[in-house]
Amino acid sequence: LIIGFGISGRHSITVTTVASAGNIGEDGILSCTFEPDIKLSDIVIQWLKEGVLGLVHEFKEGKDELSEQDEMFRGRTAVFADQVIVGNASLRLKNVQLTDAGTYKCYIITSKGKGNANLEYKTGAFSMPEVNVDYNASSETLRCEAPRWFPQPTVVWASQVDQGANFSEVSNTSFELNSENVTMKVVSVLYNVTINNTYSCMIENDIAKATGDIKVTESEIKRRSHLQLLNSKAS
């Protein structure tokens, strides 16, 4: 969480951003809030990116003002007009690119004053893993698959019964480059699994951590997946 305050002239207003991550090829949100102001016509929202000459986005006098927008963001940005009223200046970024990573500034002007805060935006690929029983294998085997990751993640297996056990000797992980030549499909196989146990396949890079759980009993198979973005700190 980054909290910024305005400087000089008018009063300063508090602007708050939250570091976040974007999943390449999908839409992302750059989060920013400010002290709401009743005079809507005076609210100006500017998004800037370090190292980029033009603006990322500008919202002024109730509408988008994109004459100064940098080419790399053309047609890819939007603010949520009805949310501006409650002090939400978050930016929607369409079709996130690897090159969108960097330091952004959310700069706000209202009738009460000015303020800004920076935001670190990471980009990569992350997806939910699915763990299944591999019935084609000769022994009891689990197969963990996740379609899109970047940068290359680590994969670790764990089990509820054998807590702390190292499964690296009885597992095999491969990374297959996807057709767009950036993201990779993650496939990890765990051998010699025992029944009535819960196994977890944990995939992690510096952007996200995802876990796929599977519980295999005589009568049923239960699955659960969870994905968590890392380094979501507010400013």
Epitope: E35, I38, L40, A81, V84, G87
Partner: antibody, heavy 116, light 107 residues
Framework: QVQLVQSGAEVKKPGSSMRVSCKAS????????ISWVRQAPGQGLEWMGG????????NYAQKFQGRVTITADKSTSTAYMELSSLRSEDTAVYYC?????????WGQGTLVTVSS | EIVMTQSPASLSVSPGERATLSCRAS??????LAWYQQKPGQAPRLLIY???TRATGIPARVSGGGSGTEFTLTISSLQSEDFAVYYC?????????FGPGTKLEIK
Amino acid sequence: QVQLVQSGAEVKKPGSSMRVSCKASEDTFSSYAISWVRQAPGQGLEWMGGTAPIFGTTNYAQKFQGRVTITADKSTSTAYMELSSLRSEDTAVYYCARGGPYFDYWGQGTLVTVSS
Amino acid sequence: EIVMTQSPASLSVSPGERATLSCRASQSVSSNLAWYQQKPGQAPRLLIYGASTRATGIPARVSGGGSGTEFTLTISSLQSEDFAVYYCQQYKNWPFTFGPGTKLEIK
């Protein structure tokens, strides 16, 4: 001087619709949102919804969704609030106010009585 | 939606004394809170916004405080015109919601 002038009191039959107007100064209309808040006899304040002509947005409270329509006529700087399928519980004073997010100027209120 | 509660429902205070009214939000509203005063037969009047900023024309004896979920409105040295109903309102999220009000009565 900021003024919000509302239409007069009305008596309505259950099942019918009501429409209350709120005339504001040009500056108010072009720079601020206009919200509608109602107050049943002896009760508290209830936000119904609001419009921000400058943003081209309108928001409604879930409770009134589908039954309330808030519109704005920029040419006359007038906001309207229409409530349909009226029932006795809709008997209240209806206020227009300048704002959200908060409300710094209020209309004089319009009493709408729903009775058969 | 964010639910606002106010306490006490009514408060009897003598003129010249101090009154403290409380408002609680069901989740954090940061400082996005306003206070209104309403007298019988009149429209509400904005007293405080941003939890602690006095609206235009509001005397210094009226003050607001708090952030997050707990807020107070304090009126020091009560005068006859202060006896009314007071409402808090959050504007952190849609829909905007009001508290049920606190009636400030003359003791």
